[in-house]
């Protein structure tokens, strides 16, 4: 499937719903639809409280039944393994695809785990992670943070992805901020052109 590299903050902000959950088994084809659904057991909701309303949890994650339509294929057989799932909410159901941000919770860095729980939300609607996939690239706005992991690391899983969030420094300026113990340290030259 044609998936653009995504910074975890972008995945968080662009998703209707972000949860921690366990996959309980093989997918079930939904007759007369293009969907299949995985039974899941939600352990924690990280985003989507407003959208969900009174719903106490999600029992299923829906995905296209065909890989050619970006269906998600869950490969892990470990039912006790917890996953971070960032998806869309449609008709009260959680929808995921092969492009969804969906990773084992333990694969996230401690900084990312912390950010999904409480930090990324501060940048949503205010700041934008701007991917730099080819040099030269420059910021188009002071509310953008230049994401250079793909160029510097050759992968979307790099230092900015693992340890930084794009957060408001003041009402008109967003900068990369370190997700370590102190939330006040900025990445040097965060606003410079690459």
């Amino acid at each position: 499937c044609s998936c653009a590299p995504t910074h975890p903050q972008t995945a968080f902000c662009n998703s209707d719903l972000v949860i921690r959950a366990k996959f309980m088994g093989s997918p079930e084809i939904i007759e007369t639809t293009l969907y299949q659904r995985y039974e899941i057991k939600m352990t924690k909701m990280l985003k989507g409280f407003d959208a969900v309303g009174n719903a106490t949890g999600f029992r299923f994650a829906y995905t296209p039944a065909m890989e050619s339509l970006c269906g998600y294929v869950h490969k892990s057989q470990n039912r006790s393994e917890e996953f971070l799932i960032a998806g869309r909410l449609r008709n009260g159901n959680l929808h995921i695809t092969a492009c969804s941000f969906l990773v084992p919770w333990h694969n996230l860095s401690p900084a990312q785990q912390k950010a999904f729980v409480k930090t990324y939300s501060a940048g949503c609607g205010v700041c934008t992670v701007f991917p730099c996939s080819a040099i030269p690239c420059k910021l188009e706005s002071d509310s953008h943070c230049l994401w250079t992991d793909q160029i510097l690391m050759g992968s979307e899983k790099g230092y900015q992805s693992d340890h930084f969030a794009c957060l408001p420094r003041n009402p008109d300026l967003c900068t990369w901020q370190y997700l370590g113990v102190s939330m006040t340290r900025s990445l040097p030259l965060a606003k410079a052109e690459a």
Epitope: C1, L34, T63, M66, S68, L69, C70, R90, H95, S100
Partner: antibody, heavy 116, light 108 residues
């Protein structure tokens, strides 16, 4: 029964882009997939890509990766296919098709002519 | 990608004769994801057979599909004048959708 109505014929210059629309009526637009298929003069059918509007993620044939963008607007029940960096070989009839585990309903086709 | 090879490229027959069209896949395809289409000049394709053997709504009983794995067949038991057209097989099984190159059924 679903009906798919496509936008009209286009004549484009090499290097430019074209955006073809496909409006659906009847059925639940968001829940099924829309695929795009093209057919060059005298040639066979070629799948370009598809999207399920409710999921919002498109998949593209390897051949068209980076040149084609398929989107869907749930509010107007319309799917779009944009092809960029056009060349003369892109002259073809472009079809949208409702997709289940087969293509059960087709648009009337849109002729795109690329000529300098 | 899964490659579908149709044979023959052209089939010259007379009305009333039986037509047998072949579609061979480069790797095994689930029958659920194999379809056949008919296309006439200047028209959009029309679904004939889905799931390898199920006739689409409104398709006459003279059309039938069979096969599994890598070999699939479309049979027209007795050709009517309106059946002379080009026929395509299609698979939606893998990460990509592919069509065969087509078989043209022409009047002998």
């Amino acid at each position: 029964q679903v009906q798919l109505v496509q936008s009209g014929a286009e004549v484009k210059k090499p290097g430019s882009s074209v955006k073809v629309s496909c409006k659906a009526s009847g059925g639940t637009f968001s829940s099924y997939a829309i695929s795009w298929v093209r057919q060059a003069p005298g040639q066979g059918l070629e799948w370009m890509g598809g999207i399920i509007p409710i999921f919002g993620t498109a998949n593209y044939a390897q051949k068209f990766q980076g040149r084609v963008t398929i989107t869907a607007d749930e509010s107007t029940s319309t799917a779009y296919m944009e092809l960029s960096s056009l060349r003369s070989e892109d002259t073809a009839v472009y079809y949208c098709a409702r997709t289940y585990y087969y293509f059960d309903s087709w648009g009337q086709g849109t002729l795109v002519t690329v000529s300098s | 990608d899964i490659v579908l090879t149709q044979s023959p490229a052209t089939l010259s027959l007379s009305p009333g004769e039986r037509a047998t069209l072949s579609c061979r896949a480069s790797q095994s395809v689930s029958s659920s994801y194999l379809a056949w289409y008919q296309q006439k000049p200047g028209q959009a394709p029309r679904l004939l057979i889905y799931g390898a053997s199920s006739r689409a709504t409104g398709v006459p009983a003279r059309f039938s599909g069979s096969g599994s794995g890598t070999d699939f067949t479309l049979t027209i038991s007795s050709l009517e004048p309106e059946d002379f057209a080009t026929y395509y097989c299609q698979q939606l099984y893998g990460t990509s959708v592919t069509f065969g190159q087509g078989t043209k059924v022409e009047i002998k």
